[in-house]
């Protein structure tokens, strides 16, 4: 026999937001495998810059996302399933890893704001990659993606170390509408943006964290009254 | 070795057309940016235009844009400059350079061809 | 009239040291692009000589070499050789015109 009333009701809403959260979870990973497994990109790791060093933090970043993306499809299956299937196994293990996850982001919040300037620097170093990317074979449609992204969501374009082929491509082809690379190369420069984002708007990534924090204790709340509720109605 | 061999210069006169061709031998053309840069007879360097290696990104000097087209046939391995509404100041001598990312500047070039723009 | 200024000629007897001057702008040099310099030996084409201000491609001589400050390069050649009488550009990138600039050359002559 099923749950009922209003345990029915968390039942399905815990199936929608992990089939939410399985959905961008699936979402994050394509787009991490495409940007790791492209021609393009993966014929980047043998090409020779000549004294340019050879990227490096791009694919660590890569990897980061096909881990995030993984783990975010494993979790919201869990949920999404064991909710659906009235499993108390599955919505233990849900509330398990919920748990494990909710850890490392109290881990990783303390150690971003401890290393939050190298944190930045990394992000400048994945910008600057990407953007070498984009300009050395003008075919990476994914690393083009990524630098659009950073110029779109920072509204920024190129930074003060471009080389003179960077700055002729930016100013031809990557910057936003808008933005003048010519007189305000420096005013609009990238890496002042990460680093001010990293500094003046870490509040903003704090409220993120924290939004992230509550949705979590809230799936947890929610997987324990389900299991619950399952538990009860399989004794009557 | 390297080797950048420019053709196709001659005399032409103003308003005429021009199509000048640089093949490349002993590296990957496919793979690098190309350019071409200019000499006036008893003066210095000009830079003309650039190219990206799948013909994406292109530039033009102002002096230039608007009349001069540069293209690419990387299985070819041959680089183009179609020059049309030449003016007595395009009279030169054409140099394909290619274009190093890595060295950021034109680190091998051509022997070049002359262009005489004269009626 | 260049955007990089350069002396039109420069001389020196064999085993001397001379420098070549490149004096550019904010927006070119000053902006923190690199500053590259070219042999053009009668007759021929452009070789690059250094690169990123202070390097040597493989090939050519400790003899030459490189220094920038500020919005300034420099071309130093020691021991002066009759084979080193050339024309000698700089050549950097101009964010305002957005084009590679070259200085206007200066013409090397070794004396006797």
């Known amino acids: 026999m099923g749950v009922e009333g209003c345990t029915k009701c968390i039942k399905y809403l815990l199936f929608v937001f992990n089939f939410v959260f399985w959905l961008a979870g699936g979402v994050i990973l394509g787009v991490a495998l495409w940007l790791r497994h492209d021609p393009q990109t993966t014929n980047l790791l043998y090409l020779e810059l000549g004294d340019k060093p050879a990227p490096n933090t791009f694919y660590v970043g890569i990897y980061i996302l096909i881990a995030v993306g993984a783990v975010m499809m494993f979790v919201g299956f869990l949920g999404c399933y064991g909710a659906i299937q009235e499993s108390q196994c599955l919505l233990g293990t849900f509330f398990t890893c919920l748990v494990i996850l909710f850890a490392c982001e109290v881990a990783a919040g303390i150690w971003g704001f401890v290393n939050k300037d190298q944190i930045a620097k990394d992000v400048k170093q994945f910008y600057d990659q990407a953007l070498q990317q984009a300009v050395v074979d003008d075919d990476a449609n994914n690393a083009k993606a990524v630098v659009k992204t950073f110029h779109e969501t920072l509204d920024c374009c190129g930074s003060s170390t471009l080389t003179a082929l960077t700055t002729s491509v930016l100013k031809n082809n990557a910057c936003p509408s808008g933005s003048n690379i010519i007189s305000n190369l420096f005013k609009e420069d990238c890496h002042q943006k990460i680093d001010d984002l990293f500094s003046g708007k870490l509040y903003l990534i704090g409220i993120a964290a924290i939004v992230v924090a509550v949705i979590m204790i809230f799936e947890m709340i929610l997987s324990m009254v389900l299991c619950c509720g399952i538990r009860n109605s399989s004794v009557y | 070795e390297v080797q950048l061999l420019e053709s196709g210069g001659g005399l032409v006169q103003p308003g005429g057309s021009l199509r000048l061709s640089c093949a490349a031998s002993g590296f990957t053309f496919s793979s690098n940016y190309m350019s071409w840069v200019r000499q006036a007879p008893g003066k210095g360097l000009e830079w003309v235009s650039y190219?990206?290696?799948?013909?994406?990104?292109?530039d033009y000097a102002d002096s230039v844009k608007g009349r001069f087209t540069i293209s690419r046939d990387n299985s070819k391995n041959t680089l183009y400059l179609q020059m049309n509404s030449l003016r007595a100041e395009d009279t030169a001598v054409y140099y394909c350079?290619?274009?190093?990312?890595?060295?950021?500047?034109?680190?091998?070039w051509g022997q070049g061809t002359l262009v005489t723009v004269s009626s | 009239q260049s955007v990089l200024t350069q002396p039109p000629s420069a001389s020196g007897t064999p085993g001397q040291r001379v420098t070549i001057s490149c004096t550019g702008s904010t927006s070119n040099i000053g902006a923190g692009y690199d500053t590259h310099w070219y042999q053009q030996l009668p007759g021929t084409a452009p070789k690059l000589l250094i690169y990123g201000n202070s390097n040597r491609p493989s090939g050519v001589p400790d003899r030459f070499s490189g220094s920038k400050s500020g919005t300034s390069a420099s071309l130093a050649i020691s021991g002066l050789r009759s084979e080193d009488e050339a024309d000698y550009y700089c050549q950097s990138y101009d964010t305002n015109l957005s084009v590679w600039v070259f200085g206007g050359g200066t013409k090397l002559t070794v004396l006797g």
């Open positions: 350079a290619r274009y190093s990312y890595g060295r950021d500047n034109f680190d091998y």
């Open positions: 190219i990206s290696s799948s013909s994406t990104y292109t």
